[in-house]
Interface confidence: low
């Protein structure tokens, strides 16, 4: 018996969106027990029909899809997972993380979590959308355009994989989309910045100019800053990001957005992998999500937080990193940057928990949608009570009480914020002073989670 579907396209809703959302959520929750038996949370694997668009090892690339026939929203998520930039570290990656280089062992289904969940409780933002998860198997930050050959041991086709997935999805209902949101985490987040304009251009050329293409870049806004301790470019993790990308682009035959490429000389295209340099050149609206103290950024900067208390030099370096990142986001109107030590957020099940200035990420994304919808009516002012620029201003890691739990990397134990800050070498007097508080008051506030 085919299930009747009720198209709910929120982009068409005028007036009190919050009240409407509350009613829909209530309706969904009341209907949920009846339909729980039929609900299938899984996204199903489709390997690309065009088998010349491949993963590193020549196996066909693909995507996982869960259709939502009543919706004209499509969410395409780019997976992350570092990269490799020479024969040796790609060989090593192939031997230790093969699913990031080959489709041969991919499971037939995946569960959608976080922003990919179809449960309104877990995904109050876009639970009704068509969900697409594109596994990362090109190791090139979604930028490559070279196939496997006698000369090339591996294919690097990240940019081409995205184009081919979009092409195939047009035959599966994407052609009727109103909004395509290209999202991604970590290397996938950087992949969004590198590919969002190209996807918009592709759809225009194929005759779908009405599809609004937007980007959501999570944990992919990196800085080409000075490492805490400089190390030679030996492996993926210790190599300075500028050097790794410089080498990678040549190895992958990497492509960057045209408008950004024109801003830099030949051989300097690596600059376009860094959010604060590529963002001003993008035409599509992009929402940037970035922890101010991103663990992957710290890793490439050679900061490894062990069980030992942090030395003052390192503490200042970490604080300065947060300051620099905050500065790069000042002209990014749609951004969500909590002062936490973490990495990735949007496909975590508890992605709704973190707040900046009292606003959660799904709420901020909803406000962003509204602002884009309203901007067609030439209104450029931020919506009252619906903020989209949310960057923490407090200056140390986990000064935001809604940050995800920190674990002591040495013992694996959960730490409360006061413990964590002392562990980081922060003197409570120093932390309390700028807030105009006594250390005892601050400790009280932190342990109460306020």
């Amino acid at each position: 018996q085919p299930v009747e579907s009720f198209p709910l396209d929120f982009t068409a809703v005028e007036g009190n969106m919050d009240s409407f959302m509350a009613q829909v959520k209530s309706l969904a929750q009341s209907l949920y027990p009846c339909s729980a038996q039929q609900l299938n949370e899984d996204l199903r694997l489709h390997l690309l029909l065009n088998t010349s668009v491949t993963c590193n090892d020549g196996s066909p690339a693909g995507y996982y899809l869960k259709e939502s026939r009543g919706s004209r929203r499509w969410l395409l998520f780019l997976e992350g997972g570092w990269y490799c930039f020479n024969r040796e570290n790609c060989d090593s990656r192939y031997d230790t993380m093969r699913r990031l280089m080959s489709s041969r062992d991919w499971p037939r289904t995946r569960t959608g979590t976080g922003i990919l969940s179809s449960q309104p409780e877990e995904n109050p933002y876009w639970w009704n959308a068509n969900m697409v998860f594109i596994p990362y198997c090109s190791s090139d930050v979604w930028s490559g355009a070279s196939s496997k050959s006698e000369k090339n041991e591996y294919a690097f086709m990240g940019a081409l994989i995205i184009q081919e997935v979009v092409r195939e999805l047009l035959g599966r209902g994407l052609s009727g989309a109103k909004v395509l949101l290209l999202a991604g985490s970590s290397a996938g987040g950087t992949g969004v910045l590198l590919n969002v304009d190209r996807v918009a251009e592709q759809l225009e050329k194929l005759g779908y100019p009405a599809i609004q293409v937007r980007g959501l870049a999570d944990s992919g806004w990196f800085l080409d800053n000075k490492q805490y301790r400089h190390t030679d470019c030996v492996d993926t993790i210790t190599c300075a990001p500028t050097e790794a990308i410089r080498r990678g682009i040549r190895y992958w035959n990497g492509v960057v957005p045209e408008r950004c490429r024109r801003q830099f000389q030949e051989g300097e295209e690596w600059n376009c992998f860094f959010g604060y340099k590529v963002y001003p050149t993008l035409r599509c609206p992009v929402f940037v999500v970035q922890w101010l103290f991103d663990e992957a950024q710290l890793t490439v900067d050679n900061v490894h937080l062990t069980g030992q208390p942090v030395q003052e030099g390192l503490r200042l370096y970490i604080q300065n990193l947060g300051r620099e990142l905050r500065h790069t986001l000042k002209d990014v109107p749609a951004s969500f940057a909590p002062a936490c030590l973490s990495h990735e957020i949007i496909i975590r099940s508890h992605w709704t928990d973190v707040q900046v200035k009292g606003t959660s990420l799904p709420r901020a994304l909803h406000c962003w949608d509204r602002s884009l919808h309203d901007s067609h009516k030439a209104s450029k002012t931020p919506l009252k009570g619906c903020p989209v620029h949310l960057v923490d201003s407090c200056p140390w890691p986990h000064c935001n009480p809604s940050c995800p739990t920190v674990r002591d990397q040495f013992t694996g134990q959960e730490m409360n914020v006061a413990q964590f800050l002392m562990h980081m070498g922060f003197d409570m007097q120093t932390v309390a002073q700028p807030q105009g508080l006594e250390p005892s008051e601050l400790l009280g506030m932190l342990s109460n989670g306020s």
């Epitope: 997972g81 040796e88 060989d91 192939y94 230790t96 490894h304 990397q409």
Partner: antibody, heavy 119, light 111 residues
Framework: EVQLVESGGGLVKPGGSLKLSCAAS????????MHWFRQAPEKGLEWVAY????????YYADTVKGRFTISRDNAKNTLSLQMTSLRSEDTAMYYC????????????WGTGTTVTVSS | DIVLTQSPASLAVSLGQRATISCRAS??????????MHWYQQKPGQPPKLLIY???NLESGVPARFSGSGSGTDFTLNIHPVEEEDAATYYC?????????FGSGTKLEIK
């Protein structure tokens, strides 16, 4: 059944040579990186050498570098360890092991072959 | 090279009780959400047998009384309830980088 079987061990004089083999069966050998380990009598496990699935990358422990050579023949499903300039401290049980490709742990081990270096 | 310090060197546990073995790495062996630490069991005259991979995942066919935990540099293998057949030497191993190294082993005796 997934299996690794070592052979070629024996008694050899210091300075001598020996070639160990490891025959793989029950799985697609060419898909896996392979390692050699050794264990001296009443001692712990020591890594000796590694070869990637397609022989593109090889690594050796400092203690054997320049004396031992790891190789593989994917057509014949065999892994080899050529040992030269043998020393008494090379005396051990030698194991070949399959490295699982998603995490670098060793999920299949051979039964071992004994190498004794003594005059 | 990463040094793995295993403790205790030997352990005697009564049948049905809990055995806890620790392994501390000289450097963090966790990255990008994975902890590259694994546990093996070895009985006399036999090769090592994989028990736990990536810190906490039970290898197929291994009884559920074996469990692993930890992240960063500190890892633990628990066996509960201990059975007669668990008498063996247990090794931790990291795969965070080459060379992969092993702990010095913990010999478990059943009382």
């Amino acid at each position: 059944e997934v299996q690794l079987v070592e052979s070629g061990g024996g008694l050899v004089k210091p300075g001598g040579s020996l070639k160990l083999s490891c025959a793989a069966s029950g799985f697609t050998f060419s898909d896996y990186g392979m390692h050699w380990f050794r264990q001296a009598p009443e001692k712990g496990l020591e890594w000796v050498a590694y070869i990637s699935s397609g022989s593109r990358t090889v690594y050796y422990a400092d203690t054997v570098k320049g004396r031992f050579t790891i190789s593989r023949d994917n057509a014949k499903n065999t892994l080899s360890l050529q040992m030269t300039s043998l020393r008494s401290e090379d005396t051990a049980m030698y194991y070949c092991a399959r490295k699982h490709y998603n995490g670098g742990y060793f999920d299949v081990w051979g039964t071992g072959t004994t190498v004794t270096v003594s005059s | 090279d990463i040094v793995l310090t295993q403790s205790p060197a030997s352990l005697a546990v009564s049948l049905g009780q809990r055995a806890t073995i620790s392994c501390r790495a000289s450097k963090i062996v966790s990255t990008s959400g994975y902890s590259y630490m694994h546990w093996y069991q070895q009985k006399p005259g036999q090769p090592p047998k994989l028990l736990i991979y990536l810190a906490s995942n039970l290898e197929s066919g291994v009884p559920a009384r074996f469990s692993g935990s930890g992240s960063g540099t500190d890892f633990t293998l628990n066996i509960h309830p201990v059975e007669e057949e668990d008498a063996a030497t247990y090794y931790c191993q990291h795969s965070r980088e080459l060379p992969p190294t092993f702990g010095s082993g913990t010999k478990l005796e059943i009382k």
